[in-house]
Amino acid sequence: MQKGDQNPQIAAHVISEASSKTTSVLQWAEKGYYTMSNNLVTLENGKQLTVKRQGLYYIYAQVTFCSNREASSQAPFIASLCLKSPGRFERILLRAANTHSSAKPCGQQSIHLGGVFELQPGASVFVNVTDPSQVSHGTGFTSFGLLKL
Amino acid sequence: MQKGDQNPQIAAHVISEASSKTTSVLQWAEKGYYTMSNNLVTLENGKQLTVKRQGLYYIYAQVTFCSNREASSQAPFIASLCLKSPGRFERILLRAANTHSSAKPCGQQSIHLGGVFELQPGASVFVNVTDPSQVSHGTGFTSFGLLKL
Amino acid sequence: MQKGDQNPQIAAHVISEASSKTTSVLQWAEKGYYTMSNNLVTLENGKQLTVKRQGLYYIYAQVTFCSNREASSQAPFIASLCLKSPGRFERILLRAANTHSSAKPCGQQSIHLGGVFELQPGASVFVNVTDPSQVSHGTGFTSFGLLKL
């Protein structure tokens, strides 16, 4: 579905994947009802969406998690949408914070992040969370994507 | 506001409607400050948005609900964005889960879902919730929409 | 990144700013990793995004706040996305409501609002909250934006 050869549609929607890694960066997969419009956006190392063209992008992430106040640290559960541009330091674009539930064994909550940002060629976006083991991976609960305006 | 005769803007935003039906599918109406760009997207039976053209769509829903842990089932409140394509089974695109509040008589919470998906001609999207009687229908609290990239 | 002289990209993303004002309207700034595509959308008085061209816009806001049930009024925390069109009364486009947390000193929660709306030339959108003193202004927690379809 093209806007024209010089201006193709660029969009992605990837699905969360559990990981044995202890990193706070969430892992994603091209599985289920995923979107990858063309090679102008790619999922790299299962962790970041990388774009080839400069421009304005609407970037979003949704994270569902299950946590309990007594079993977790006092700090809230935080999901961060982060940007790594070539030759630049990482920076936080968006964050959401939810205090842990008092429900037992854990209480589920969903976070949604989204915003319009200028990305440079080769820029990558990824999602960080405070505790990846609390993230829910059932169908549709946790996903990540972007679209070029 | 056209992009051109061959590529018109396609967008919809509909407003929640209380229903006496016991179905878990939420009901919507073209009321208040709604959007229905043209007949390339329609609200069918007050329950689903149906598109006539294939392409990538950003689809979103927002659900505000009021529930209490003691008065509700142990299962969390779940909102699901679902897809029915012609000749295919229904499938879940997105879900969010929120554990019920301990507040009395009930605690309000809002869920937002959104993502980019490829839709076929005649595809319909709709929103399911675990308990429609808990959904808030005050101005602006619960809505559903899409836009074609 | 232009679609053409007659159809330039129009998008904005602004960042929350703490304010000493007692008004319920949130304050925003062009700071950090903000977006302001051109002069067809402007941030006026640090409180509203105003558009010059009629059309369909996806408008969104994210608000993170920290509140406590005992220290707050019984009413929930409500965030509202509002519209002021020239010669018209203000109206609510979207709202989200979250009951205050029982966590002490306060529990953090994040709200996301988003939808597609027709805006007239000179229309302004802004965000209201029940208690601006509870809003979190750390990097990425609270933001507001739009994009023209």
Partner: nanobody
């Protein structure tokens, strides 16, 4: 309390097949993610394959085309069909299930691929 019991491991020759089973008790497969991990001696645990309640599957690159994950919701059981086994598939295989955000892990079953 959720309990997982794996079975089907054992010794097999290169090129052979095995079918691992993971029976879950104390839960119903309503909204779930289920996966098989493996850990070879001296190596990190890695995800081999996963499936969700919607039927979405995912595989590690090293097993694509050889392994198939499936689930029988009526029996609360998940399976990993492993074909064309290689010596490098030798490891302890662990079943893991996440239901409504809650994790459960099996004790593991040893798979040895050797001639």
């Amino acid at each position: 309390e959720v309990q997982l019991v794996e079975s089907g491991g054992g010794l097999v020759q290169p090129g052979g097949s095995l079918r691992l089973s993971c029976a879950a008790s104390g839960l119903t497969f309503s909204s779930y993610w289920m996966g098989w991990f493996r850990q070879a001696p001296g190596k990190e645990r890695e995800l081999v394959a996963s499936i969700t309640d919607g039927g979405s599957t995912n595989y590690a690159d090293s097993v694509k085309g050889r392994f198939t994950i499936s689930a029988d919701n009526s029996k609360n059981t998940a399976y990993l069909q492993m074909n064309s086994l290689k010596p490098e598939d030798t490891a302890v295989y662990y079943c893991a299930v996440q239901v409504n955000g809650i994790w459960a892990w099996g004790q593991g079953t040893l798979v040895t691929v050797s001639s």
